[in-house]
Interface confidence: medium
C-alpha cells in the first residue's frame, strides 16, 4: 500500500526531502516553477499504492510590454516578465502622460498602459448625441476653453446645458435629446 | 503598510464649496496615481476623477465644471475640491490609490459630507 | 456611459453553499473589477481584471465572464463573506460600477 517514486508534473517541483518509500496517506506538497503559478490544489496523496491529485502549474508570465505611442521604456527590458512585475514609461517631449507611468504583469496579461498626449489641451471631435447633433460644423480639432452646441431633432427635447467646453482635453458632458411623453 | 488618510469637513452650505486632503504613506504620488469615488444611498458608488502620477487629470464629465484635483508630491498629499454643491451632493467621498486598468486597491477611510443649510 | 445591472440585489446563502452572483453590462467592457465592501467600511478590492483575486483575497472566491456578462463565484460560502460586493467596468470612460449584491448569511 505504500508509493515509490514522486510523480513528476511540468513545471512543478516537488517540496520537502526526497524519499524512496511514501507510507499510505502520506501527502507531498508541489511548488511552481518561476514564471508559473498553481492552478487548484497542489498536493498528491498516496492512496493504495497510487498517488492522487495532478497539481497543474500554468504559465502567468508576460512578453513585450504594451507599445505607447510618442513613449519610451526606461526599466529595464526583459524577454520574460514575471507576474507581478511593473515596466515604468516615459513620454517623449512634448506629450504629457496621461494613466500611470507604470504597467504591470498581472497572470500573464499587462494592465491598462498610459498614453501621451498633446499636453497643450485640445479636444478632439464633440461627443455624439443620439437624436442630436452640433450647430456648427465639427473639426477634427478644438482648441482649450472651445466650446459648440448641441440642438435636437424634431420632436425631441434637449435635457442639460446646450453648451460644452473644452478643458484639459475632455469635453464636458454634452446634453440629451429625449422624446417628449405623449399623453 | 499602504495608507490614505482623508480631512475634512462634514457638513456643507448649500453652493459653497468642499475642499478633502488625502494624505497618503507608503507609496508615492510620482508612481501611483489616485481616484475620488463618492457613495450616496441614492446614486450608489460614483467616480468623480483621478490625479495620474505625471499630475494630469482626467475627470468624469458629469463633475468637470465643479471639480478640480490637484496635489503635492512631496508632501504626499492629494487636494479635491468641488464647487457649487448641491443637497444631491451628500454622500461619502473617498479617495483611492490605483491599481490598474482603473481599479483601485487601496481606498481611504472615506469622508462623510452632508450639505444642508 | 455604460450602465452595469448587478443580480440577484440580495442573497441568501447557507456555510458551505456555493453562490454565483453576476453582473451584465449596457455595452461590451473591457475589463471588470470586483469589491466587497462590509457596513460601515470602505470598500476593499477584490477581483481585479475579471479573474485575478487581489492579495489576501480566499482561493475558495472566482471571477469570470467577458463581453457584457461577468461573474463572482463561491465555492463554500463562509460566515466572514457577508458583505455586499460590487462590480464596476473599466473600457468606457467614465468607469461605472454596479448597485451591488449583498450576501447575507442564513
Known amino acids: 500500500t505504500d508509493c515509490l517514486s514522486l510523480p513528476s508534473f511540468e513545471n512543478a517541483i516537488p517540496m520537502g526531502e526526497k524519499k524512496d518509500v511514501y507510507k499510505a496517506g502520506e501527502q507531498v506538497t508541489y511548488t511552481c516553477a518561476t514564471y508559473y503559478k498553481m492552478d487548484g490544489a497542489s498536493n498528491v496523496t498516496c492512496i493504495n499504492s497510487r498517488w492522487t491529485g495532478r497539481p497543474t502549474c500554468r504559465d502567468t508570465s508576460c512578453v513585450n510590454p504594451p507599445t505607447v505611442q510618442n513613449a519610451y521604456i526606461v526599466s529595464r527590458q526583459m524577454s520574460k516578465y514575471p507576474s507581478g512585475e511593473r515596466v515604468r514609461y516615459q513620454c517623449r517631449s512634448p506629450y504629457e502622460m496621461f494613466g500611470d507611468e507604470e504597467v504591470m504583469c498581472l497572470n500573464g496579461n499587462w494592465t491598462e498602459p498610459p498614453q501621451c498626449k498633446d499636453s497643450t489641451g485640445k479636444c478632439g471631435p464633440p461627443p455624439p448625441i443620439d437624436n442630436g447633433d452640433i450647430t456648427s460644423f465639427p473639426l477634427s480639432v478644438y482648441a482649450p476653453a472651445s466650446s459648440v452646441e448641441y440642438q435636437c431633432q424634431n420632436l425631441y427635447q434637449l435635457e442639460g446645458n446646450k453648451r460644452i467646453t473644452c478643458r484639459n482635453g475632455q469635453w464636458s458632458e454634452p446634453p440629451k435629446c429625449l422624446h417628449p411623453c405623449v399623453i | 503598510q499602504v495608507q490614505l488618510k482623508q480631512s475634512g469637513p462634514g457638513l456643507v452650505q448649500p453652493s459653497q464649496s468642499l475642499s478633502i486632503t488625502c494624505t497618503v504613506s507608503?507609496?508615492?504620488?510620482?508612481?501611483?496615481?489616485v481616484h475620488w469615488v463618492r457613495q450616496s444611498p441614492g446614486k450608489g458608488l460614483e467616480w468623480l476623477g483621478v490625479i495620474w502620477s505625471g499630475g494630469t487629470t482626467e475627470y468624469n464629465a458629469a463633475f468637470m465644471s465643479r471639480l478640480t484635483i490637484t496635489k503635492d508630491n512631496s508632501k504626499s498629499q492629494v487636494f479635491f475640491k468641488m464647487n457649487s454643491l448641491l443637497v444631491d451632493d451628500t454622500g461619502i467621498y473617498y479617495c483611492?490609490?490605483?491599481?490598474?486598468?482603473?481599479?483601485?486597491?487601496?481606498w481611504g477611510q472615506g469622508t462623510s459630507v452632508t450639505v444642508s443649510s | 456611459q455604460i450602465v452595469l445591472s448587478q443580480s440577484p440585489a440580495i442573497l441568501s446563502a447557507s456555510p458551505g453553499e456555493k453562490v454565483t452572483m453576476t453582473c451584465r453590462a449596457s455595452?461590451?467592457?473591457?475589463?471588470m473589477h470586483w469589491y466587497q465592501q462590509k457596513a460601515g467600511s470602505s470598500p476593499t478590492a477584490w477581483i481585479f481584471a475579471t479573474s485575478n483575486l487581489a492579495s489576501g483575497v480566499p482561493p475558495r472566491f472566482s471571477g469570470s465572464g467577458s463581453g457584457t456578462s461577468y461573474s463572482l463565484t463561491i465555492s463554500r460560502v463562509e460566515a466572514e463573506d457577508a458583505a455586499t460586493y460590487y462590480c464596476?467596468?473599466?473600457?468606457?470612460?467614465?468607469?461605472?460600477f454596479g448597485a451591488g449584491t449583498k450576501l447575507e448569511l442564513k
Open positions: 464596476q467596468q473599466w473600457g468606457t470612460k467614465p468607469p461605472t
Open positions: 483611492a490609490r490605483n491599481f490598474g486598468n482603473y481599479a483601485v486597491d487601496y
Open positions: 507608503d507609496f508615492s504620488l510620482t508612481n501611483s496615481g
Open positions: 455595452s461590451s467592457v473591457r475589463y
